[in-house]
Interface confidence: medium
Amino acid sequence: MAVTACQGLGFVVSLIGIAGIIAATCMDQWSTQDLYNNPVTAVFNYQGLWRSCVRESSGFTECRGYFTLLGLPAMLQAVRALMIVGIVLGAIGLLVSIFALKCIRIGSMEDSAKANMTLTSGIMFIVSGLCAIAGVSVFANMLVTNFWMSTANMYTGMGGMVQTVQTRYTFGAALFVGWVAGGLTLIGGVMMCIACRGLAPEETNYKAVSYHASGHSVAYKPGGFKASTGFGSNTKNKKIYDGGARTEDEVQSYPSKHDYV
């Protein structure tokens, strides 16, 4: 029950995370104009991974796509790639995890297969989350670098004259959405991996103890109770659960040194 809950919760958390990664990737507010020095501005600029927008004092907004591919900064291209890889891995992970869910029965799928699928989707979610966090962090680092560079330029004008014309950009809402979404996908992936351990069939087998009390003879097999630790090998090629156990008909009482009258 706990395994099903952990798996289900992991799936839901990852689903929310991937939806967030998609939303962040599509959002225009990756970087927004810093209004610290000029809160009452006629124009508000903000930029996304795919287009740049301007909002005027009237409230009217216009966006323009980056129609060039070669002219864009390498860092922006890298961020785009990381986010897309994150989305693709996450989407595949979701698809795999749907079939891996314990509450969903598909034909006669073994628990071991479900466990493997759960682990696969979990790893995919973890990588997806890491891609999103990496992408957002790279963009944030780029912003911080540019922000301080433009701040330095602002106050080192000609003859120490302050230049306030330079537009500085700060963190946009998409960055926070991306960080949270990446984190959720990562957590969901970890939960799926934990659930996988619970889904995997137990390797601990117990060989049955054979007791026989018919008439005067009691057949007792010492050492018949053996927990398989994985170190001993099944040398006699018997069925693993056979364990030397016998039915009433099979067991014959031959005199031996272990027989007590």
Epitope: A42, V43, N45, V54, R55, E56, S58, F60, E62, R64
Partner: nanobody
Amino acid sequence: EVQLAESGGGSVQAGGSLRLSCAASRYISSSYCMSWFRQAPGKEREGVAAISTRGGSTYYVDSVKGRFTIFQGNAGATVYLQMNSLKPEDTAMYYCAAAEGLCGWGGWESAVRFGSWGQGTQVTVSS
């Protein structure tokens, strides 16, 4: 490309008013930045005021703020520049210019951004 024609220029005493109009050859449906520039003899062309045809956001150079008003006509094909409290330093040739996109993209005060220009109308302010 949009064809532009200015009118309304003339001579006026300092402190007087004038209204310049800029008529576009067609109704501007998409977003355009309509700007008024002026060029005094021996000086560079400078942006005076601008308006975004969509949204109606307005922009002014510091020297005319509070004195000049830019606005659109109801038809959407005419832009006006209402000039009050005129000064002798406002004497110049006034040009109307149009560029695609909101003025907020920047460069409304720079002639480089604008592809469509009118012939200009002369404004003379005497003291």
